[in-house]
Interface confidence: medium
Amino acid sequence: GYFPLSHPMTVAGPVGGSLSVQCRYEKEHRTLNKFWCRPPQILRCDKIVETKGSAGKRNGRVSIRDSPANLSFTVTLENLTEEDAGTYWCGVDTPWLRDFHDPIVEVEVSVFPAGTTTASSPQSSMGTSGPPTKLPVHTWPSVTRKDSPEPSPHPGSLFSNVR
């Protein structure tokens, strides 16, 4: 892949269920907008949801809420479908990348059939491809999973901005 992460974070949820990803950030990013996006191609990533201040935002089945006091923001994906599986970015709205995954972290979302038991193992995305001179990652996620017994009849799409 094109991300120099030794352990990209993976999170899994059941079809029809929901999952939440908590993305942490440094205090210098407290006042900036936070976003969640799905990169359609390398170096390009259209935002699905983005915070505006501390108010929560929703776009279809995806919501985002910033918690500046905790230096984290939470993205929740609801009524999961198999099409929701794939790579996403957790990011901070700044012009800068000090490293390609800062302040953006790659999150791999997996969706499994409802009723299947699987463990979601949150991994800290702090690796780099070479020996770091300074820990470059300033955003890191953790995950919680919420199971839902039945799939939603109207799953819809996770993102509206498709290029």
Partner: antibody, heavy 116, light 110 residues
Amino acid sequence: EVQLLESGGGLVQPGGSLRLSCAASGFTFSSYAMHWVRQAPGKGLEWVSAISGSGGSTYYADSVKGRFTISRDNSKNTLYLQMNSLRAKDTAVYYCASGYGLMDVWGQGTLVTVSS
Amino acid sequence: QSVLTQPPSASGTPGQRVTISCTGTSSDVGNYNLVSWYQQLPGTAPKLLIYSNNQRPSGVPDRFSGSKSGTSASLAISGLRSEDEADYYCSSYTGSNALLFGGGTKLTVL
């Protein structure tokens, strides 16, 4: 096709003002940080300014701080650079570029000439 | 703000391997993993060749490769072709919310 198109360049006297525009198409403009980079005739590239996707964060090179203002109108898919108190050394081709600290899409540039 | 140091010129014959260096400081190149390289053909806008030290965007031939060690980065071009004749610039983020470019290297294919 992802495209950036600059306009607004021209001849201006020292001390004068000019506003450059950069029209974006082919991508969701509000999702991306934008930059202005300039290149004096026969010289190298110089980063000028940057703005975050939402427009909430702006940054400037020391050489233009206090004189230039970067802004964007996401409803019009347009990036701007307001240049005041222009000096002869500001003469350059000005490029707009898109990306998070690296520029993977560039416009063709617009020439600004500051001369009396 | 200063510029990253690049040799003003480099040259090679078709088929050769050429390397262009880019030297910064511990505040920019040495501290961050986002050295980018740009190619500027005569009369055109720059084009991204390498990002994040050694990653190639799609469409860039694998003849172009990047590396970084300490406060220096390098761009290597193998199997040199006449169409590679251009100016090459390195770039790095700095800790003071700014981008630095190198002075540029004019590559001549003999």
